[in-house]
């Protein structure tokens, strides 16, 4: 007996062929022998059978004895052994259909669980192996579990059913919300516009939910929200904000936000939480805000930085074209009575430059000219 | 746009045959299959049969089989049916109608009809 | 032979009433049913095939539904020109076989 597999939803064609190469009677019946369809001369008939609105032939291959049954739309319960009499014979045929869906949807948020469920016949014995977009490969029976899903997992899974040496392959297409990415820094001299992205990793046709920006100043003792807003199909509206600092947010997607000016109070870490409708859970991003100022006071010229910097990040205090006089790992460096001249300060990570703030150091009976 | 002309009334006496045409234009001969339907005077609709232009098989409601013969002249673009041994009861109005023929199933609705024949059997 | 059976076998109207009229088949034709109007000396016209595809210029106050065995056509507002015979015929296999007709006329 041929076995045919066949997928939930797709269309199928079961052939059967007669020795003469010519348009003869034949008829499809199921196991309970009843008519599916056949034919009346060129004409084709059908029966009572359950499969009535699905089931179709192909009349232009009868004439090369060709009489497929062709069954759209397949059901799980559809899997049964049709037979096709044609010529005082009759051929069998297996139908397996099966169905691949994922747990309630295919848009997830980050870090949750994926899993893939089979739907299979009575009396079949399907493996499944599934591939992820990032070539992680995961191997089941009825249920497939994926946990902790990572950005990389977003797009096309390609999942293999095996049943009697045959094959059916599912390709299901998950989208993992997130941001493009877990957290980022800004780095600005004090008195600078600040601008915040939190792009998505993303699109869908109709985005809403409500999100929120909470702020821990390095120098504050707790975190305080900043922003609340709603998202309705993409449109980004303001519910509340903080009158210090008057943060001002875009209203179109990516989400965009503006500290007007980069001051010390404001260096830190905040973290943006977006709740999408329907979804339990929460999109996170961090991002971060160091400050650098750069003053003289007297005879002391001074380079400060704030917010959350590693302890590999380099500050340096330096004349334009000459040395660093002063190079240090740490959150502050100074020179006692610097030479006249364009100083610059500057935050580098491995020799690259992160941040600089310039200043002018005029001969000592003058002041100080900050550009 | 499809239509069909059906030949006129006719007047037979019992025992005898009756030829009604029904000739198409508007589209491609061979692509409508043709439906013969009755409606005896007062009463419901009849399917007789039908008849595939393009190869000239038919089907032929039992009822009709013996007496009834559906034939199609491709140069015309005419279908032709024979009513033989025709009784009292035979007295009614024969329409031809269409189905439009797919590759696939589209079922045997008739969307274009002639206006229909006469037929009066009468001693 | 499919045997198709309607209700009711006439009723009285009046323009703007909602008229449904039920067909149904001694076994399952799928959804391979057409409704058609058939006024007095004149030919059908198809109404509706597949069980609820509208045929090309057929107003949509007629609709119809159903699969299986159970049909219905409706009219949600009965016009001037609706008062006719209706009737339902299984499209599905030979002999195809027509419902006995249900006749709308003017309460």
């Known amino acids: 007996k041929k076995v045919v597999l066949g997928k939930k939803g797709d269309t199928v064609e079961l052939t059967c062929t007669a020795s003469q190469k010519k348009s003869i009677q034949f008829h499809w019946k199921n196991s309970n022998q009843i008519k599916i369809l056949g034919n009346q001369g060129s004409f084709l008939t059908k029966g009572p059978s359950k499969l009535n609105d699905r089931a179709d032939s192909r009349r232009s291959l009868w004439d090369q004895g060709n009489f497929p049954l062709i069954i759209k739309n397949l059901k799980i319960e559809d899997s049964d052994t049709y037979i096709c009499e044609v010529e005082d014979q009759k051929e069998e045929v297996q139908l397996l259909v099966f169905g691949l869906t994922a747990n309630s949807d295919t848009h997830l948020l980050q870090g949750q669980s994926l899993t893939l469920t089979l739907e299979s016949p009575p009396g079949s014995s399907p493996s499944v192996q599934c591939r992820s977009p990032r070539g992680k490969n995961i191997q089941g029976g009825k249920t497939l579990s994926v946990s902790q899903l990572e950005l990389q997992d977003s797009g096309t899974w390609t999942c293999t059913v095996l049943q009697n040496q045959k094959k059916v392959e599912f390709k299901i297409d998950i989208v993992v919300l997130a941001f493009q990415k877990a957290s980022s820094i800004v780095y600005k001299k004090e008195g600078e516009q600040v601008e915040f992205s939190f792009p998505l990793a993303f699109t869908v046709e109709k985005l809403t939910g409500s999100g929120e920006l909470w702020w821990q100043a390095e120098r504050a003792s707790s975190s305080k929200s900043w922003i609340t807003f709603d998202l309705k199909n993409k449109e980004v509206s303001v519910k509340r904000v903080t009158q210090d600092p008057k943060l001002q947010m875009g209203k179109k997607l990516p989400l965009h936000l503006t500290l007007p000016q980069a001051l010390p109070q404001y260096a830190g870490s905040g973290n943006l939480t977006l709740a999408l409708e329907a979804k339990t859970g929460k999109l996170h991003q961090e991002v971060n805000l160091v400050v650098m100022r750069a003053t003289q006071l007297q005879k002391n010229l001074t380079c400060e930085v704030w917010g959350p910097t590693s302890p590999k990040l380099m500050l340096s205090l330096k004349l334009e074209n000459k040395e660093a006089k002063v190079s240090k790992r740490e959150k502050a460096v100074w020179v006692l009575n610097p030479e006249a001249g364009m100083w610059q300060c500057l935050l580098s990570d491995s020799g690259q430059v992160l941040l600089e703030s310039n200043i002018k150091v005029l001969p000592t009976w003058s002041t100080p000219v900050q550009p | 746009q499809v239509q069909l002309v059906q030949s006129g009334a006719e007047v037979k006496k019992p025992g005898a045959s009756v030829k009604v045409s029904c000739k198409a234009s508007g589209y491609t001969f061979t692509d409508y299959y043709l439906h013969w339907v009755r409606q005896a005077p007062g009463q419901g609709l009849e399917w007789m049969g039908i008849?595939?232009?393009?190869?000239?098989?038919?089907s032929i409601a039992q009822k009709f089989q013996g007496r009834v013969t559906m034939t199609r002249d491709t140069s015309t673009s005419t279908v032709y049916m024979e009513l033989s041994s025709l009784r009292s009861e035979d007295t009614a109005v024969y329409y031809c109608a269409t189905t439009a023929y797919y590759d696939f199933w589209s079922g045997y609705s008739m969307d274009v009809w002639g206006k229909g024949t006469t037929v009066t059997v009468s001693s | 032979d499919i045997q198709m059976t309607q209700s009711p076998s006439s009723l009285s109207a009046s323009v703007g009433d909602r008229v449904t009229i039920t067909c149904r088949a001694s076994q399952g034709v799928g959804n391979d049913l057409a409704w058609y109007q058939q006024k007095p000396g004149k030919a059908p016209k198809l109404l509706i095939y597949?069980?609820?595809t509208l045929q090309t210029g057929v107003p949509s106050r007629f609709s119809g539904s159903g699969s299986g065995t159970d049909f219905t056509l409706t009219i949600s507002s009965l016009q001037p020109e609706d008062f006719a015979t209706y009737y339902c015929?299984?499209?599905?296999?030979?002999?195809?076989?027509f419902g006995p007709g249900t006749k709308v006329d003017i309460k």
């Open positions: 597949a069980a609820s």
């Open positions: 008849i595939d232009p393009s190869g000239g098989s038919t």
């Open positions: 015929q299984q499209a599905s296999s030979f002999p195809l076989t």
